[in-house]
């Protein structure tokens, strides 16, 4: 999905009013220094793509973060703030429902929602020139 | 205007079955996750089912297994079929929009189940 | 699911203070979301995310959420401002959201 044509302020609005906090107490108990951030992106619909792909695909290590409460919420603001998002989905969420994976809590899970924080910071901070 | 309008409450024997629909106008009804709650006479609000616009569901624990949430996205209905209904599930029956998944920011004005015999 | 206790009822005069509580476990934790509810009306969203509030709400409501209470301030509280309020949030791990018991509203005179 090309999301250059999601409405950016409105996901960032959402992401600051209603998914940040269960992203914190995901990582509660985490020291904040425990992750290097090794993920990056250089513009908001870059961030979204690169946000997209570490909250809904399995990884090894970490197959369950799209059963979180931050992960459903982030498909919910993508849903109604980038066009065509939820049609473009269907189909692939079709195949998804029939490897349902339990909600697990791994050491690799962390490092990847620590990844997470990092890009949805960079997302709301647009016009900071790439380190 | 955003709207959401209920249909299909009514007086039901207990065991019997029942579907509401919800017709929804005013916004882009596909891109939202939507749901039911209830409130039984002078109680308090019980959130029932949601559903994603790709068909994911959520049920309470009180109606799973027994009630099966639907949407058809090219009509804008939403709909719960109720089945082997019981004396407690009478309720006036809300369709909500859910946004972000996380809370409801658009409520129909509802419609009343009874269960009796 | 996580369990929301609210108080049954809540008495303020005219122009004073009221503040409606919201009790679960961790639930400075979680968003927390306030709907006041008329008789005989649906429910309307009065605080979101804690403390914001929508469009077309009066700036007397105002929200607060820490440790294991959240709060509904209502400033210079008027008369139409009566109603049933409810506190809702969600659980983790169910993924389900949970409504507090609702709190009536009275103002006295």
């Known amino acids: 999905y090309d999301f250059t044509n999601c409405d950016f302020e409105k996901i960032k609005a959402a992401y600051l009013s209603t998914i940040s906090k269960d992203l914190i107490t995901y990582m509660s108990g985490t020291k904040s220094t425990e992750f290097n951030n090794t993920v990056s992106c250089s513009n908001r619909p870059h961030c979204l793509t690169e946000i997209q792909s570490l909250t809904f695909n399995p990884t090894a290590g970490c197959a369950s973060l799209a059963k979180e409460m931050f992960a459903m919420k982030t498909k919910a603001a993508l849903a109604i703030w980038c066009p065509g998002y939820s049609e473009t989905q269907i189909n692939a969420t079709q195949a998804m429902k029939k490897r349902r994976k339990r909600k697990v809590t791994t050491n690799k899970c962390l490092e990847q929602v620590s990844q997470l924080q990092g890009l949805w910071r960079r997302f709301n901070r647009p016009l900071l020139k790439q380190q | 205007q955003v709207q959401l309008v209920e249909s299909g409450g009514g007086l039901v024997q207990p065991g019997g079955s029942l579907r509401l629909s919800c017709a929804a106008s005013?916004?882009?009804?596909?891109?939202?996750?939507m749901s039911w709650v209830r409130q039984a006479p002078g109680k308090g609000l019980e959130w029932v089912s949601g559903?994603?616009?790709?068909?994911?569901?959520y049920y309470a624990g009180s109606v799973k297994g027994r009630f099966t949430i639907s949407r058809d996205n090219s009509k804008n209905t939403l709909y719960l079929q109720m089945n082997s209904l019981r004396a407690e599930d009478t309720a006036v029956y809300y369709c909500?929009?859910?946004?972000?998944?996380?809370?409801?920011?658009?409520w129909g004005q509802g419609t009343l189940v009874t269960v009796s015999s | 699911d996580i369990e929301l206790t609210q108080p049954p009822s809540v008495s303020v005069a005219p122009g004073q203070t009221a503040r409606i509580s919201c009790g679960g476990d961790?639930?400075?934790?979680?968003?927390v979301y306030w709907y006041q509810q008329k008789p005989g009306q649906a429910p309307v969203l009065v605080i979101y995310?804690?403390?914001k509030r929508p469009s077309g709400i009066p700036e007397r409501f105002s929200g607060s959420n820490s440790g294991n209470t959240a709060t509904l301030t209502i400033s210079g509280t008027q008369a139409e401002d009566e109603a049933d309020y409810y506190c809702?949030?969600?659980?983790?791990?169910?993924?389900?959201?949970?409504f507090g018991g609702g709190t009536k509203l009275t103002v006295l005179g």
């Open positions: 961790s639930l400075g934790g979680k968003y």
């Open positions: 909500a929009r859910q946004q972000y998944f996380d809370h409801i920011d658009i």
């Open positions: 559903i994603f616009f790709d068909g994911e569901t």
């Open positions: 809702q949030s969600y659980d983790l791990q169910s993924l389900n959201i949970v």
């Open positions: 995310g804690d403390s």
């Open positions: 005013g916004f882009t009804f596909s891109s939202y996750y």
